[in-house]
């Protein structure tokens, strides 16, 4: 039962994270939550950084600055892969949740 619950939590978190991405950067509250998660967990996107390509409000050569290894204003514009965290947040934060919840 514990595993089923954990999988359900992960699935919900994945869906919620992707939903919040759709509102980025239009919703300031959403943006600050996502930015905080990406910066704190050193991750980018849900499955990986390429998820940001699919967000209509984001230029395809851009990820949020919070994805950058060294966060500075504009660092996510015209990004180079070597300068950003490539791992997705769902797996990374999920791993943390599994250990700590």
């Amino acid at each position: 039962a514990g595993y089923v619950f954990r999988d359900k939590v992960m699935s919900e978190f994945n869906n919620n994270f992707r939903q919040q991405m759709e509102n980025y950067p239009k919703n300031n509250h959403t943006a600050s939550i996502l930015d905080r998660m990406q910066a704190d967990f050193k991750c980018c996107g849900a499955a990986n950084y390429t998820d940001w390509e699919k967000i209509p409000s984001m230029s395809k050569n851009r990820v949020p600055d919070s994805c950058c290894i060294n966060v500075t204003v504009g660092c996510g514009i015209n990004f180079n892969e070597k300068a950003i965290h490539k791992e997705g947040c769902v797996e990374k934060i999920g791993g943390w949740l599994r250990k700590n919840v």
Epitope: N48, S59, N61, I77, E81, K82
Partner: antibody, heavy 119, light 108 residues
């Protein structure tokens, strides 16, 4: 020193195919996005395609999408452009171009390889 | 897509002249603007990146300025080797990567 050397150009009939290669040396290939940029005779520069460091991201100009395919072999430090359904307006010099991205410009260009599409 | 428009399309000048080429973007591109020089039969060469930063090895007579939508490339004192075609290019929002149509600098 840093070098980009294109090959594979030539004369091809309309509807034909060609594969361009770009052999690189003198730098860490995986640190860079790579581009193909072309220039038709007497015309300006036209971006064709780019590929990210790992190859996860690939984009194409509208004029070539569905006909051209960009790829890279990071073990061989090489970039490729597979061109099919070639048309007369694809006739151009094709340049392999290194791109550090972010605020920096496309800093190293190959010498170019000429593709001529004609019957 | 962001369009880049250069002016003039061609320009005649003499050795020692001060020359300015302008580039306008169809929307703001911050400072994500690069300038290239191309000589006949040769590959383009990066001169200026980020609107105003001089690429390593490029003579200091070349300078760039501007941000947002309007940019300029200035050659303070033309040398014989500067007669070439110059292109601007934006990297703020891609794909596509877009270039200006070019400015041909000729000897008067």
């Amino acid at each position: 020193q840093v070098q980009l050397v294109e090959s594979g150009g030539g004369l091809v009939k309309p509807g034909g195919s060609l594969r361009l290669s770009c052999a690189t040396s003198g730098f860490t290939f995986t640190d860079y996005f790579m581009n193909w940029i072309r220039q038709a005779p007497g015309k300006g520069l036209e971006w064709v395609s780019y590929i990210s460091n790992s190859g996860s991201i690939r984009y194409y100009a509208d004029s070539v999408r569905g006909r051209f395919s960009i790829s890279r072999d990071n073990a061989k430090n090489s970039l490729y452009l597979q061109m099919s359904s070639l048309r007369a307006d694809d006739t151009a010099v094709y340049y392999c171009v290194r791109d550090p991205r972010q605020i920096y410009g496309m800093d190293v260009w190959g010498q170019g390889t000429t593709v001529t599409v004609s019957s | 897509d962001i369009q880049m428009t250069q002016s003039p399309s061609s320009l005649s000048a003499s050795v020692g002249d001060r020359v300015t080429i302008t580039c306008r973007a169809s929307q703001s591109i911050s400072s994500y603007l690069n300038w290239y020089q191309q000589k006949p039969g040769k590959a383009p060469k990066l001169l200026i990146y980020a609107a105003s930063s001089l690429q390593s090895g490029v003579p200091s007579r070349f300078s760039g300025s501007g941000s947002g939508t309007d940019f300029t490339l200035t050659i303070s004192s033309l040398q014989p080797e500067d007669f070439a075609t110059y292109y601007c290019q934006q990297s703020y929002s891609t794909p596509p990567i877009t270039f200006g149509q070019g400015t041909r600098l000729e000897i008067k």
